[in-house]
Interface confidence: low
Amino acid sequence: AMFIVKNGNGTACIMANFSAAFSVNYDTKSGPKNMTFDLPSDAKVVLNSSSCGKENTSDPSLVIAFGRGQTLTLNFTRNATRYSVQLMSFVYNLSDTHLFPNASSKEIKTVESITDIRADIDKKYRCVSGTQVHMNNVTVTLHDATIQAYLSNSSFSREETRCEQDRPSPTTAPPAPPSPSPSPVPESPSVDKYNVSGTNGTCLLASMGLQLNLTYERKDNTTVTRLLNINPNKTLASGSCGAHLVTLELHSEGSTVLLFQFGMNASSSRFFLQGIQLNTTLPDARDPAFKAANSSLRALQATVGNSYKCNAEEHVRVTKAFSVNIFKVWVQAFKVEGGQFGSVEECLLDENNM
């Protein structure tokens, strides 16, 4: 939905076009409960609370109201070169029985948080991927967002600042480090099946072989690249299902923890591998505790309800020092009907080899 704040002479100073999903934890008499709901289509800008700001006293704010007393507020600020949603706040009324059935208290609660929504002055902020803002007991996820404050001509600028999540992430193998010590190449890793289930059934099915490609400095100051296979027989799998995030956590030998995070683009209904985190121990390394993470990947993409399949080896670069080689991957996230893989979307590598 589009939300606009105008000043006294009718010129727009804030324009925002987004959909939003709310996840709220609250107490009922029978214990804690989580409710998820979307910003309804009849949500409106509260004109007497929203503001274009005053030169010396306040900054622009967008206040959106819906339901029985819920308001979402975006407070903007700027410096010399950039503006941002410095603070997002959400007021919710637990007496709204449509949204919060059986709430044990009927109070009005307010939560707030800083955000990473920011853009260059005279550019719009654009984020197709979900932007999550975590507050106390509440998570707000903005989808397919276009936002701009401090407008100069009552319309979105042509130029845009893209959010971190939308920026492309290379999925090629990392470049070889300067003259690393050679490392014996292990065989291809064994392929294993993984599944993650939640209260609504299976949210992740995966079949793949996993190999870690690690570059690190040894105690003798030499740089080495090692390939480590994840052995399914020595790996415990767990995970979690969420409306916008599905995780697969693998605990393997050598105190290795490998975490995969799958995200979903609601506007295009596609899932993708969004993040990888690794914690492991390398006994011969100068710093034995090896940690790496990247939460803005774009790999293994397919339409929700379909599966992604690739027989060719895929290299997913996580950091300069760490990539994951994925063998014979077949994966489906979020929507898995009957515990079976859906229609297959082949990777480009396979299509090119056909």
Partner: antibody, heavy 122, light 111 residues
Framework: QVQLQQSAAELARPGASVKMSCKAS????????MHWVKQRPGQGLEWIGY????????EYNQKFKDKTTLTADKSSNTAFIQLNSLTSEDSAVYYC???????????????WGQGTSVTVSS | NIVLTQSPASLAVSLGQRATISCRAS??????????MHWYQQKPGQSPKLLIY???NLESGVPARFSGSGSGTDFTFTIDPVEADDVATYYC?????????FGGGTKLEIK
């Protein structure tokens, strides 16, 4: 009350890495940015950057971008800074501090940890 | 990067007198009527402490002896009257743009 408890002093060799922690208590961790500031012996203060625990994204002073990695663990309300490829120039006290948003009056660092001293010596 | 120049580098003031510290920015730290300049106190062996935010606003719990003023590029920090407990180094800091920068500090001593 708000408290930022930093990890103990570190002694490291040149070329090594160190990882320091800053455990926050007394407030909602994800509602504020966590900043890191460096102070060399007898010198002034240098801003390294901050981590936003809500979104998981860091923002770096370009001067420190290749030297430091800022992270956080929301489950334990703890922020981390890792210094890589240590040299004698990295010998300093490193402070974590909370970024507080004063509405239109901007951000300032309203609470500070006690600092972690890093000594790089062969 | 915005450079903040503090003066004097050190200052000796008698108890009960006024101490004044200046901070000059290489470019304006005002925008839209807001000033992104703050002042901190650091006592020997301790962490910095926020005293003044946004040029002139006293942080909660800070005595009214401390005050700040200024806009644009020129700022002043004042302690009146000075007490023995005020022996410390005082820093100005801007965050109108990244990277945030601090002044070089002013060391306050008692005469």
């Amino acid at each position: 009350q708000v408290q930022l408890q930093q990890s103990a002093a570190e002694l490291a060799r040149p070329g090594a890495s160190v990882k320091m922690s800053c455990k926050a208590s007394g407030y909602t961790f994800t509602s504020y940015t966590m900043h890191w500031v460096k102070q060399r012996p007898g010198q002034g203060l240098e801003w390294i950057g901050y981590f936003n625990p809500s979104s998981g994204y860091p923002e770096y002073n370009q001067k420190f971008k290749d030297k430091t990695t800022l992270t956080a663990d929301k489950s334990s309300n703890t922020a981390f800074i890792q210094l890589n490829s240590l040299t004698s120039e990295d010998s300093a006290v490193y402070y974590c501090s909370r970024g507080y948003y004063y509405g239109s009056r901007g951000y300032a660092l309203d609470f500070w940890g006690q600092g972690t001293s890093v000594t790089v010596s062969s | 990067n915005i450079v903040l120049t503090q003066s004097p580098a050190s200052l000796a003031v008698s108890l009960g007198q006024r101490a004044t510290i200046s901070c000059r920015a290489s470019e304006s730290v005002d925008i839209n009527g807001n000033t992104f300049m703050h002042w901190y106190q650091q006592k020997p062996g301790q962490s910095p402490k926020l005293l003044i935010y946004a040029a002139s606003n006293l942080e909660s719990g800070v005595p009214a002896r401390f005050s700040g003023s200024g806009s644009g590029t020129d700022f002043t920090f004042t302690i009146d009257p000075v007490e023995a407990d005020d022996v410390a180094t005082y820093y100005c800091q801007q965050n109108i743009e990244d990277p945030w920068t601090f002044g070089g500090g002013t060391k306050l001593e008692i005469k």
